[in-house]
């Protein structure tokens, strides 16, 4: 009897990530003794819902509760019936929403209402759904990682849970992307902040960290490209729009009232003289660099540094951890290797952009090809961002790991969530007493 | 909780401008639109136009276009609502409202009065 | 533009008693499904404040006393209850379109 293991109290969660392209479901599972341990919850399943974003449904909210169907029984068939009641349930909404919001709150209201409506219908517990803010968003990121990443554990290892885990306690930065914006947080060398609305607090497991964060509403990769064709066809001289970001050869046809359509392109709102323009890859990384360069204001700075548009940002301070669509993205293009300098990844940008479209849509003929003719510009956006919108350098780069999950759960700001709102996340470092989580008797 | 604390009463001659001012706490300013909205003594209310803080995009009612410009300074959390060309009809209480739709939050009001 | 008609202009009711306020809007104020209707109090040095949103819905600190209905084109405003403190001006505004419109306001004053 003495190797006899117990059965396992285990405890489950489901997060939703109501994203502005689209919704993934995660169910989370930990062991009910140990919910105050670090790094003891752990992924167990992603479901990606079909179709878009939630704030794309505000034209069709009866279609709600179809589109949520597939994932919420899986999550039914994945956790076992006896624990279903006791399981949370809760859906995060995040930039999409925000933008839905800005434009209307009845309509964002009406979203939530019916999403709220169609989440209670199932048999967990469900908690509520909710647009979370910038700042969460960016905060919960952090938690995710670190948390992950073992950083929060004050146990120091002998071994290395992750190829890029580092045996100190500093904590990694979080960045994150996603189609509407993107996320920078990290604890600056200088405690003191200059800019209050970026600064937070938090003492989790006996240690206080100062964290910076921000988000930057309209600059995650969908968003960042509606402001850039909207930025660019006011100075067209025709319904044809040359443009470097995208594979030579490539047309598409863009209806002028979709591109504004979104608050993010309010300032290059003008009236033309045609509905719709026809865009025109020429496929020229340099020149797509220059254009995306255009989004960032970097002339106005009321603080003694910036990011851009005016936002403070402090020196940037010790290893990022790159996540969502930095992870994507890059992954796409084979570019994640630690081995992979700067310089080099500004080079096979160069080569993929300049590749025909009909070539480009051969060698990747299993990916659709919405997807597939934006990685151009996204490719050439996330090395714009990190570089001269985040101030990293070729010298920097190295510190920039590009993570798509940690011990098998996604990096995101999903964990971090679930892990407050169920108080698994204590200020205090846990006394844990000799053989008080033995599982053998 | 939110706030929009707007600038002082003001004293024009025609054919002058104004500059009202409009600072908001409580909440990230770039994440709702502001409204200028404004009511002549005894009138009904009349909207002006909005700015999109997050970037300074806006709209204006075509009454004033051309007259009013609404911009916006994010490091202070305010926007501002400049009327030109005054004339005496355009004395009013001026109001910051926030929202996208629903002017649930609003400014005390700046009483502008123009008056040779 | 669309026109908002607010109907009567003024009108006295008993402390205790109902009172009903109408508003016409030139053409329909819903869109996707949500009125764009809104009712606002104002009292006399004060800005206006919000009661009700989306036709309906009663903003947050608001008493139960005062309701909205209606849709498309035609809405009502109902203090079920008057009390002395409801003495104001109401006015009605949509936002489907720019530019946002307001009513004429309706005065309410004690019988």
């Known amino acids: 009897t003495q190797n006899k293991a117990l059965p396992e109290n285990i405890k489950y969660g489901i997060v939703l990530d109501a994203g502005s392209s689209h919704t993934s479901l995660y169910i989370y599972k930990w062991p009910a003794e140990k919910e105050n341990d670090t790094g003891v919850v752990h992924q167990v399943e992603e479901c990606r819902v079909k179709g878009p974003g939630i704030s794309k449904y505000v034209q069709k909210v009866n279609e709600i509760g179809i589109y949520l169907t597939d994932c919420m029984e899986r999550a039914r068939e994945v956790i076992p019936r006896s624990q279903h009641q006791e399981t949370p349930v809760y859906l995060g909404a995040t930039a999409g929403m925000r933008l839905l919001r800005m434009e209307s709150e009845e309509l964002a209201d009406r979203v939530l209402d019916v999403v709220e409506r169609s989440l209670s219908n199932y048999p967990f517990d469900f908690q509520g759904a909710r647009i979370i803010t910038g700042q969460e968003e960016g905060a919960y990121g952090w938690i995710t990682i670190n948390y992950l990443l073992g950083k929060f554990s004050q146990k120091t290892r002998w071994f290395s849970i992750v190829p890029y885990e580092t045996n100190n306690q500093e904590t990694f930065g979080a960045l994150d992307l996603g189609g509407a914006s993107t996320q920078i947080t990290f604890v600056p060398q200088n405690q003191t902040t200059e800019s209050p609305d970026n600064a937070l607090q938090f003492r989790l497991y006996g240690k206080d960290y100062n964290v910076y964060t921000h988000s930057f509403l309209c600059y995650g990769k969908d968003q960042a490209l509606w402001q850039k064709l909207a930025k660019d066809i006011q100075v067209a001289s025709n319904e044809i729009l040359r443009d470097p970001c995208f594979h030579p050869g490539y047309k598409k046809v863009v209806n002028v009232s979709d591109l504004y359509k979104t608050p993010c392109t309010k300032r290059f709102e003008m009236t033309l003289p045609f509905q719709q323009f026809e865009i025109q890859g020429i496929g020229n990384y340099q020149q797509c660099h220059q254009s995306v360069l255009e989004l960032f204001n970097t002339s106005y700075c009321p603080y003694s540094q910036c990011a851009f548009n005016g936002i403070f940002l402090p020196p940037l301070q010790g290893d990022f951890g790159a996540f969502s669509a930095f992870y994507f993205v890059m992954n796409f293009l084979n570019l994640t290797s630690e081995k992979v300098s700067q310089e080099k990844v500004t080079e096979m940008m160069k080569k993929f952009c300049s590749q025909p479209w009909e070539e480009i849509k051969t060698s990747y003929a299993g990916v659709k090809e919405k997807y597939l003719s934006e990685y151009c510009f996204s490719g050439t956006y996330i090395l714009s961002l990190l570089l001269q919108g985040y101030h990293f350098t070729a010298d920097s780069w190295e510190h920039i790991h590009f993570i798509g999950k940690i011990q098998g759960s996604d990096a995101g700001w999903t964990l971090g969530y679930m892990l407050n709102l169920t108080n698994m996340i204590p200020a205090e470092q846990p006394l844990s007493t000799p053989l008080s989580h033995s599982t053998y008797v | 909780q939110v706030q929009l604390v707007q600038s002082g009463a003001e004293v024009k001659k025609p054919g002058a401008s104004v500059k009202v001012s409009c600072k908001a706490s409580?909440?990230?300013?770039?994440?709702?639109?502001m409204h200028w909205v404004r009511q002549a003594p005894g009138q009904r209310l009349e909207w002006m136009g909005y700015?999109?803080?997050?970037?300074?995009?806006?709209t204006f009612n075509q009454k004033f276009k051309g007259r009013v410009t609404i911009t916006r300074d994010t490091s202070a959390s305010t926007a501002y609502m400049e009327l030109s060309s005054l004339r005496s009809e355009d004395t009013a209480v001026y109001y910051c409202?926030?929202?996208?739709?629903?002017?649930?939050?609003w400014g005390q009001g700046t009483l502008v009065t123009v008056s040779s | 533009d669309i026109v908002m008609t607010q109907s009567p202009d003024s009108l006295a009711v008993s402390l205790g008693e109902r009172a009903t306020i109408n508003c016409r809007a030139s053409?329909?104020?819903?869109?996707?499904?949500?009125?764009?209707m809104y009712w606002f109090q104002q009292k006399p040095g004060q800005p206006p404040k919000l009661l009700i949103y989306?036709?309906?819905n009663q903003g947050s600190g608001v008493p139960d006393r005062f309701s909205g209905s209606g849709s498309g084109t035609d809405f009502t405003l109902t203090i079920s209850s008057l009390q002395a403190e409801d003495v104001a001006v109401y006015y009605c505004?949509?936002?489907?379109?720019?530019?946002?419109?307001f009513g004429g306001g309706t005065k309410v004053e004690i019988k």
């Open positions: 505004q949509q936002t489907k379109e720019v530019p946002y419109t």
């Open positions: 409202a926030r929202g996208g739709t629903r002017f649930a939050y």
């Open positions: 053409e329909s104020v819903d869109n996707f499904g949500v009125s764009f």
């Open positions: 989306g036709a309906s």
């Open positions: 409580g909440y990230t300013f770039t994440d709702y639109n």
């Open positions: 700015i999109v803080p997050l970037n300074g995009g806006s």
